[in-house]
Interface confidence: low
Amino acid sequence: SQVSQNCHNGSYEISVLMMGNSAFAEPLKNLEDAVNEGLEIVRGRLQNAGLNVTVNATFMYSDGLIHNSGDCRSSTCEGLDLLRKISNAQRMGCVLIGPSCTYSTFQMYLDTELSYPMISAGSFGLSCDYKETLTRLMSPARKLMYFLVNFWKTNDLPFKTYSWSTSYVYKNGTETEDCFWYLNALEASVSYFSHELGFKVVLRQDKEFQDILMDHNRKSNVIIMCGGPEFLYKLKGDRAVAEDIVIILVDLFNDQYFEDNVTAPDYMKNVLVLTLSPGNSLLNSSFSRNLSPTKRDFALAYLNGILLFGHMLKIFLENGENITTPKFAHAFRNLTFEGYDGPVTLDDWGDVDSTMVLLYTSVDTKKYKVLLTYDTHVNKTYPVDMSPTFTWKNSKLPNDITGRGPQ
């Protein structure tokens, strides 16, 4: 049914879906704090621009009786139930923030006539790619795939002189929401990653992974997995690893590698960690102080969603344009706005661009060091450490196929 939007006459409302099922197990109170912090910033920016308007958020909670698993598995209907609740209350804002689960976002996008923008902190899966009124503020699986293909093909760096075309992917089904969809994208037979690789096998059992580490007949030296160092240790322990094995550990939303006092454990020496470039130090200042590094990124995405709305609202109001139009709904893409910890760039499809960082463990210092960075906006790799102190022979990454290149 047609729901009137509280989005005119100097009063602009944001509908925030507070779903029990979420991409990260973050207390809803922390997300409220993030939204409120964002509102404060937006109000100040609008006031600085001489726009005397009111911006508020309405938090829409699900009843929690039916959808109470807490993770994303039962989220498909929760988003639709919340939309029904909004519809019944005739209370829709100018923009919808949430949901974060791929299942619920996909279903909501499918089942509603979206004439308003939807901003998500999550929705990592490929099924949420290329949605005209959906904006995603945490790196989606497509961005990871493009990095991996770019890195696999790279062969002109002092520390990587071979193109790779093979990989194992470890995926045991217990992953967090972000990892689940990242690995799902790598597993998919029709994905860009699968299309570009000559060989790819998914390892689903711990034993399969453990056996590959020393298997002389392995088809690839490269294993991709997703999670933190503790997750890797639980799986790998102190087992011996063939010297030409390279483990790519995808751990995007974890700032801990950059903390001054962090020492890399010994089991990380064969590992390249893919993470995101850490933000501005002001992130330690306010709403995020008591959040874990991962949860900080999640709450930050909510906050940045508010700032994005404020950015677009300011532009449209300054141009005297109507907010409740398809033009507004489709405008949340191909732009850069001032986020909480610096500029945030959205690509042509409304997905956040970022700087991914590939780290290695220095055998000299036992510290994580930046090997290279990758700009998702231009799909380009920038080497940082031209003479890395690798564990691998000749301080070069081995070939991906056993028996060729430095062993």
Partner: antibody, heavy 119, light 107 residues
């Protein structure tokens, strides 16, 4: 007009506490964070802490054990409570409204209230 | 914590002179540098924020520049009403910190 007015200053004995008030008018109190800054005689400025619009607080680590900032939205007033005062806490205490992110400036200051710690 | 070093601590100049004050941060503050004026017996007034942005209503003779750790505040033509102490402040990270101040007098 837009203003912040501090009160509660005066002479306090060492070891005692003080509670200063900052009454805000002329703007929507609940939309802004309010900072406390002090200026000791002949010395520089020290940032003490802030209470954000949603009620969250950040303190200068040097004062965190004896400083409490609070507010009453209904009275549009922010409070600074400081315990275990010593002579070096003698200063003019200012409240200030914070500016718009990302610039983090003090957009507007009160006139200050003098606190003298002396026996 | 970030330390701010401001110089000179005082200066004396004639009306019409160009006056320059510098502020150095102990680490890169990414242009999050603000300047305030405190006239004798009065409170503080924001003049310049984010290195070079002039606060509304502030005369154009005041300006700021700089990057990284080094910043400059300039009064292009000193006026009698500019007698005051000027402070820099970093807004890069908490706790916010200030320079020690520069007292400007007329010769």
């Amino acid at each position: 007009q837009v203003q912040l007015v501090e009160s509660g200053g005066g002479v306090v004995q060492p070891g005692r506490s003080l509670r200063l008030s900052c009454a805000v008018s002329g703007f929507t109190f609940s939309n802004y964070g309010v900072h406390w800054v002090r200026q000791a005689p002949g010395k520089g400025l020290e940032w003490l802490g802030v209470i954000w619009s949603g009620g969250r607080k950040d303190y200068n680590a040097a004062f965190i054990s004896r400083l409490t900032i609070s507010k009453d939205n209904s009275k549009s007033t922010v409070y600074l409570q400081m315990n275990s005062l010593r002579a070096e806490d003698t200063a003019v205490y200012y409240c200030a409204r914070h500016g718009t992110y990302p610039y983090w400036y003090f957009a507007l200051w009160g006139q200050g209230t003098l606190v003298t710690v002396s026996s | 914590d970030i330390q701010m070093t401001q110089s000179p601590s005082s200066l004396s100049a004639s009306v019409g002179d160009r006056v320059t004050i510098t502020c150095r941060a102990s680490q890169d503050i990414s242009n999050y540098l603000n300047w305030y004026q405190q006239k004798p017996g009065k409170t503080f007034k924001l003049l310049v924020y984010y290195t070079s942005r002039l606060q509304s209503g502030v005369p154009s003779r005041f300006s700021g520049s700089g990057s990284g750790t080094d910043y400059t505040f300039t009064i292009s033509s000193l006026q009698p009403e500019d007698i005051a102490t000027y402070f820099c402040q970093q807004g890069k990270t908490l706790p916010f910190s200030f320079g020690q101040g520069t007292k400007v007098e007329i010769k």
